[in-house]
């Protein structure tokens, strides 16, 4: 069908609560495009009827709520005048038991659910709530070990929980909760966050923080197109360079002749107190020689890598 396939990182989600995923891909969705969502390579698009439990809302797919059986690979197809891209998103649903201490560790939670506070400093936790604007989110409440957080050291600031003078006792299991209202119906959103404490100096000054990638592997089929973003936060007045390297060489130089792997144009979003930079690496066609190599994102003195690996064979 002439669509280029792009594979996104897996999303691991809680059952019985709302979930939404936005199909935006800055190089593609910035112009006039149409976006259509599908599940598991179905030819039938996801419903756009807002009363449907799973429906498309503009560029979003919205689950009200997510259920156990919703795990699977979802595709959003972005069609422009002269282009077509199919973005694959693997959603894995698990049963959450934030307050049940008998349940073992949660499966490979993303970094949104693992956060760090810096000992002796003033710091903050973030409640990640990603929903379309048709969803109204009620005031966020914060819990630690299943008790609502109160006290002079804590302030709720938008989606953040400010913690002043962080102590070792602040480590533990937190949750942020909000009531989501959509078409007159209400749903609870509850995100569990595992908080650890570090004595190292926090992000600030001129040391950039690489949000993604996180030194991990990505499963990708041979021959597919893959785009990976490097997301970096840094101070507004920074002079750091951000780039992708392989074998200690800039990817654009390393693949100068074939141009098969290229670094994208850097973009940034200004967040008042810092900037969020994005620079991607595009594999036009993944080849055998790409597997096992660390592709490094550099941002000043900070580095993080991805390693491509072949998906495990399916013997079913």
């Amino acid at each position: 069908d002439g669509c280029k396939d792009i594979f996104m990182k897996n999303e691991i989600l809680s059952a019985s609560q709302p979930f939404a995923f936005n199909c935006t891909f800055p190089p593609i969705t910035s112009g006039e495009v149409s976006v259509t969502w599908y599940k598991n390579s179905s030819k039938i698009p996801v419903s756009k009827i807002i009363q449907s439990r799973i429906h498309q809302d503009e560029t979003w797919i919205l689950f009200l709520p997510m259920e156990w059986g919703d795990s699977g690979v979802y595709q959003c197809v972005i069609k422009g005048r002269d282009s077509c891209h199919r973005i694959h998103v693997n959603l894995t649903v698990f049963e959450k038991h934030w307050c049940d201490t008998s349940i073992g560790g949660l499966p490979n939670l993303s970094d949104e659910y693992k956060q760090i506070l810096h000992l002796g400093k003033d710091d903050s936790l973030t409640c990640h709530l990603h929903f379309p604007k048709s969803c109204v989110l009620g005031p966020i409440k914060w819990y630690k070990d299943c008790n609502e957080i109160k006290g002079e050291r804590f302030t709720v600031l938008e989606t953040r929980l400010l913690v002043s003078n962080v102590s070792a006792e602040d480590r533990g299991n937190y949750a942020c909760q909000a009531i989501l209202t959509h078409s007159g119906k209400q749903y609870e959103v509850l995100n569990g966050i595992t908080v650890s404490i570090t004595e190292r100096a926090g992000y600030g000054g001129s040391v950039p923080k690489i949000i993604y990638p996180k030194n991990h592997s990505i499963e990708v089929q041979l021959g597919t197109t893959l785009i990976v973003d490097c997301n970096v936060t840094d101070t507004k007045d920074n002079t750091n360079l951000r780039c992708w390297r392989v074998n200690n060489t800039l990817v654009d130089d390393y693949y100068d002749e074939s141009k098969r792997i290229r670094e994208g144009v850097e973009t940034h979003v200004s967040f008042r107190e810092h900037n969020l930079y994005t620079v991607n690496i595009t594999f036009l066609e993944v080849k055998m020689e790409d597997y096992g190599l660390p592709f490094m994102c550099h941002a000043g003195v900070s580095t993080a890598y991805i390693i491509l690996q072949l998906p495990a064979p399916d013997f079913r």
């Epitope: 969803c135 989110l137 600031l157 989606t159 953040r160 600030g204 007045d237 810092h274």
Partner: antibody, heavy 117, light 107 residues
């Protein structure tokens, strides 16, 4: 809890410099976020003046930029506003406020500054 | 600068009435739209941030919507304590700017 207290003279003569300080308790101004000054002339709307960020960089409203300076004293967890060459049009209630990622989330109670000879 | 046009500039309604205030931005503000409530002699208080998120302690009768350039703010059932001036504010592009305000009174 995060709290703000504005302080400074309530009366300033025309052509002089207005100076105000905002004392923050409950969170370090060097930890994160942008720390703002906003004003409201009597019976009128709100005008953003400028901010100093946690890293010390500043940004000012272009309409006031030539007259505004925002500084900070990290040892006292304070940030300050200086507005030079004031006129009667600068008579206003001046607020300090923290800006989260999206909004002016918490404000001081404000202090009225009157410009008059 | 982005101009924020709020309407109406004032309104009078009865307790229990549904009240709607609109705010139009002169440019696209990508949902970076906030609403504040200010009572006489007090500092403004944040009610809603980023178009559709209610701030801590804000009752559910305050309900926002909108996107692009046009945003609305509804009080589903007006209460005596809602008597105040309401401001919209864009946080997308510096300098950050406010609407002219809507004064809400009880009939």
């Amino acid at each position: 809890d995060l709290q703000f207290q504005e302080s400074g003279p309530g009366l300033v003569k025309p052509s002089q410099t207005l100076s105000l300080t905002c004392t923050v308790t409950g969170y370090s101004i060097t930890a994160d976020f942008a720390w703002n000054w906003i004003r409201q002339p009597p019976g009128k709307g709100l005008e953003w003046i400028g901010y100093i960020s946690y890293s010390g960089d500043t940004n000012y409203n272009p309409s006031l930029k030539s007259r505004v300076t925002i500084t900070r004293d990290t040892s006292k967890n304070q940030f300050s506003l200086k507005l030079s060459s004031v006129t009667a049009a600068d008579t206003a209630v001046y607020f300090c406020a923290i800006r989260g990622p999206y909004s002016f989330t918490y404000w001081g109670q404000g202090t009225l500054v009157t410009v008059s000879s | 600068d982005i101009q924020m046009t709020q309407s109406p500039s004032s309104l009078s309604a009865s307790v229990g009435d549904r009240v709607t205030i609109t705010c139009r931005a002169s440019q696209w503000i990508n949902n970076y739209l906030n609403w504040y409530q200010q009572k006489p002699g007090k500092a403004p208080k944040l009610l809603i941030y980023y178009t559709s998120m209610l701030h801590s302690g804000v009752p559910s009768r305050f309900s926002p919507s909108g996107s692009g350039n046009d945003y609305t703010f509804t009080i589903s059932s007006l209460q005596p304590e809602d008597i105040a001036t309401y401001y919209c504010q864009q946080g997308h592009t510096l300098p950050w700017t406010f609407g002219g305000g809507t004064k809400v009174e009880i009939k």
